[in-house]
């Protein structure tokens, strides 16, 4: 039995940031799971991992340098990516593994989401100094 995953076919990161929602045919509430996002046709780069342990706080990390966060819905995990680079334009695949309770479940490979990163359009001008932080 495999979990089905739905993703948007394409997203554009206009300001080097994007939110990618992974929708599952499975309710993750009160489950121990590992949701991850993978980059490339071969899914070779694990972009971000969101680890959920029942109703506790999500643990988020990246072994590959991506700035990411995650939000949990009953049947979804949304990955928030910041500081993306133009050369990270690629196809991204959602993956889900449910560790507990048994049986172990994972997903059928999804169609993926093409994330097109459009860099910040910087137009420096002496008349308009940079923004200020509070």
């Amino acid at each position: 039995n495999k979990i089905l995953v739905k993703q948007s076919p394409m997203l554009v990161a206009y300001d080097n940031a994007v939110n990618l929602s992974c929708k599952y045919s499975y309710n993750l509430f009160s489950r121990e799971f590992r949701a991850s996002l993978h980059k490339g046709l071969d899914s070779a780069v694990e972009v971000c991992v969101v680890y959920g342990n029942y109703s506790q706080q999500l643990q988020v990390y990246s072994k590959t340098g991506f700035n990411c966060d995650g939000k949990l819905g009953n049947e979804s995990v949304t990955f928030y990516l910041q500081n993306l680079y133009v050369n990270q334009t690629d196809i991204y695949f959602c993956k889900i593994e449910v560790m507990y309770p048994p049986p172990y479940l994972d997903n059928e490979k999804s169609n993926g989401t093409i994330i097109h990163v459009k860099g910040k359009h910087l137009c420096p001008s002496p008349l308009f100094p940079g923004p200020s932080k509070p």
């Epitope: 700035n67 995650g70 939000k71 910041q82």
Partner: antibody, heavy 120, light 107 residues
């Protein structure tokens, strides 16, 4: 005026636990990511943990993952760091810091720090 | 993780002189680089964010430049209160990392 005040530091033995607190005021605490950054005596700054604005997600550096847990109570405007299985190399001044939602890891405001000493 | 290397480790200058501090990243961090000032016994203070933007209340004598892997903090004319340790920090790649610091001391 933004204020962050850390408390809870002290002298503990290796293997023991400690909980640090950071009381926040002067801003909308529940709208900001919060962080812990530490500085060993005479050394540089090292980011160790963060929590998002509603406390639903967290990340930690490899050096503390599995031992330290960050949490927050938005009703009390307080950030916490639960430190378990402490080691001598955890000896440092621990700072809490604030970032905003558009720049997750840019540390706009800092507390004055609290010293944690791990020694037998 | 990205390693930030600051140079020099110590800079000995007199008030009124120009200070130039360098920060080099082990790989590109785009413009996601910040500078902090830390005085003895105090917390760090954000000076510059995103390479060249001054934080609120930071005097115009502080400026930042660079992109990719090479960055510079310049203090155009040192004031007595500027003698401190300066750290660069990147947020372009996770986890965020700091340089080891440059101490600006009175000559």
């Amino acid at each position: 005026e933004v204020q962050l005040v850390e408390t809870g530091g002290g002298l503990v033995q290796p293997g023991e636990s400690l909980r640090l607190s950071c009381a926040a005021s002067g801003f909308s605490f529940s709208s900001n990511w919060m962080h812990w950054v530490r500085q060993a005596p005479g050394k540089g700054l090292v980011w160790i943990s963060r929590i998002n604005s509603d406390g639903s997600s967290a990340s930690s550096a490899d050096s503390v993952r599995g031992r330290f847990t960050i949490s927050r109570d938005n009703a009390k405007n307080t950030l916490y760091l639960q430190m378990n299985s402490l080691r001598a190399e955890d000896t440092a001044v621990y700072y809490c810091a604030r970032s905003d939602s558009s720049s997750w890891y840019e540390f706009e405001y800092w507390g004055q720090g609290t010293l944690v000493t791990v020694s037998s | 993780e990205i390693v930030l290397t600051q140079s020099p480790a110590t800079l000995s200058l007199s008030p009124g002189e120009r200070a130039t501090l360098s920060c080099r990243a082990s790989q590109s961090v785009s413009n996601y680089l910040a500078w902090y000032q830390q005085k003895p016994g105090q917390a760090p203070r954000l000076l510059i964010y995103d390479t060249s933007n001054r934080a609120t209340g930071i005097p115009a004598r502080f400026s930042g430049s660079g992109s990719g892997t090479d960055f510079t903090l310049t203090i155009s004319s040192l004031e007595p209160e500027d003698f401190a340790v300066y750290y660069c920090q990147q947020r372009g790649n996770w986890p965020p990392t700091f340089g080891q610091g440059t101490k600006v001391e009175i000559k």
